[in-house]
């Protein structure tokens, strides 16, 4: 009685259960009554990551430096290459097919979370008592200078973009 289903790591062909090719190898010829499945290793820059009956291996992903990409981990015969972005850039999608420059936080805003290879900079408005006077992808909001601790008084109030200006206390004559 010919089988209708096969064991794990096997496939049904011509009413017969043949062994699948292991990861890193492709199918050359199906098994027969007298011969085993014939498999061949994937070539240079190729891979197959599952037990398979593929006749062609997949090409490793190319991390194109012109798109801001670099190789995070090189592919093997069983795994694809993993791309990520060069320093100062982040992926535009989960597949990381291209990169864009990290955004900077404008004056009045500080960095809440520094960008990574896969996520952009997260900015936040500087709350009362804090300021940022630069456009930066790294700088957080800085606290206003405390004039009191320096035995000075506030001569000019701070804003979300400027620090307070301290000055000497008026002496009573």
């Amino acid at each position: 009685e010919p089988p209708t289903a096969c064991r794990e790591k096997q496939y049904l062909i011509n009413s017969q259960c043949c062994s699948l090719c292991q990861p890193g190898q492709k199918l050359v010829s199906d098994c027969t009554e007298f011969t085993e499945t014939e498999c061949l290793p994937c070539g240079e820059s190729e891979f197959l990551d599952t037990w398979n009956r593929e006749t062609h291996c997949h090409q490793h992903k190319y991390c194109d430096p012109n798109l801001g990409l670099r190789v995070q981990q090189k592919g093997t015969s069983e795994t694809d290459t993993i791309c990520t972005c060069e320093e100062g850039w982040h992926c535009t999608s989960e597949a990381c097919e291209s990169c864009v420059l990290h955004r900077s936080c404008s004056p009045g805003f500080g960095v809440k979370q520094i960008a990574t290879g896969v996520s952009d900079t997260i900015c936040e408005p500087c709350p009362v008592g804090f300021f940022s006077n630069v456009s930066s992808a790294f700088e957080k909001c800085h606290p206003w200078t405390s004039c009191e601790t320096k035995d000075l008084v506030v001569q000019q109030a701070g804003t979300n973009k400027t620090d307070v200006v301290c000055g000497p206390q008026d002496r009573l004559r």
């Epitope: 430096p65 190789v71 995070q72 981990q73 090189k74 993993i82 990520t84 290879g117």
Partner: antibody, heavy 114, light 110 residues
Framework: QSLEESGGRLVTPGTPLTLTCTVS????????MGWVRQAPGKGLEYIGV??????ISYYATWAEGRFTISKASTTVDLKITSPTTEDTATYFC??????????WGPGTLVTVSS | AVLTQTPSSVSAAVGGTVNIGCQSS????????LAWYQQKPGQPPKLLIY???TLASGVPSRFKGSGSGTQFTLTISDVQCADATTYYC???????????FGGGTEVVVK
């Protein structure tokens, strides 16, 4: 971003030695890290690399069994299993794949002598 | 893999041009995983060119890389006294175990 090797010293043949590469500002889960050596007055010799995500180490054919590369969160180690006088060299730690452009540490000198 | 670098030594006059060849016994990864490094005495190698022809950050445009597959060339034009040192090519392959360096080329500037 910087990397610095340490652990290089004078050892007697057969005494295992571990060199450490300490990184700063480099995410080791995002970069492959390799080791290269250079005997005095000679050329550069590739030892091996440890992959970023998988942490699997790959070695030059000649280096297989003679060296072990491993990593922690901010360090990458190179263990010289059983040094011989031929292993006298400056050992460099490198960020990235050699053939795809890499950043190098200043190196650490290992002298093997009885 | 084997990387054969030629010549092992070359001399040039200031302002002249130098060509260094690098031949691989098999194709490098993606046909372009070939880097060029400059090494001055007592210093670690410094990256000049990667992906066969991409100039590394901060490297003068006098340095130019070309080639693909198994044949590569580093060209230094308008040679300066500071260029007098040793240059290495390095190849990356499908298998990381095959990564290798060329034997080096010493550039002498007259």
């Amino acid at each position: 971003q910087s990397l610095e090797e340490s652990g290089g010293r004078l050892v007697t043949p057969g005494t295992p030695l571990t060199l450490t590469c300490t990184v700063s500002g480099i995410d080791l889960s995002s970069y492959a890290m390799g080791w290269v050596r250079q005997a005095p007055g000679k050329g550069l010799e590739y030892i091996g690399v440890i992959a970023s995500n998988s942490g699997i180490s790959y070695y030059a054919t000649w280096a297989e069994g003679r060296f072990t590369i491993s990593k922690a969160s901010t360090t990458v180690d190179l263990k010289i299993t059983s040094p011989t006088t031929e292993d006298t060299a400056t050992y460099f730690c490198v960020r990235g794949y050699i053939g795809d452009g890499a950043l190098w540490g200043p190196g650490t000198l290992v002298t093997v002598s009885s | 893999a084997v990387l054969t670098q030629t010549p092992s030594s070359v001399s040039a006059a200031v302002g002249g041009t130098v060509n260094i060849g690098c031949q691989s016994s098999k194709s490098v990864y993606y046909n372009n995983w070939l880097a060029w490094y400059q090494q001055k005495p007592g210093q670690p190698p410094k990256l000049l060119i990667y992906r066969a022809s991409t100039l590394a950050s901060g490297v003068p445009s006098r340095f130019k890389g070309s080639g693909s597959g198994t044949q590569f060339t580093l060209t230094i034009s308008d040679v300066q006294c500071a260029d007098a040192t040793t240059y290495y090519c390095a190849g990356g392959y499908s298998s990381d175990s095959d990564t290798t360096f060329g034997g080096g080329t010493e550039v002498v500037v007259k």
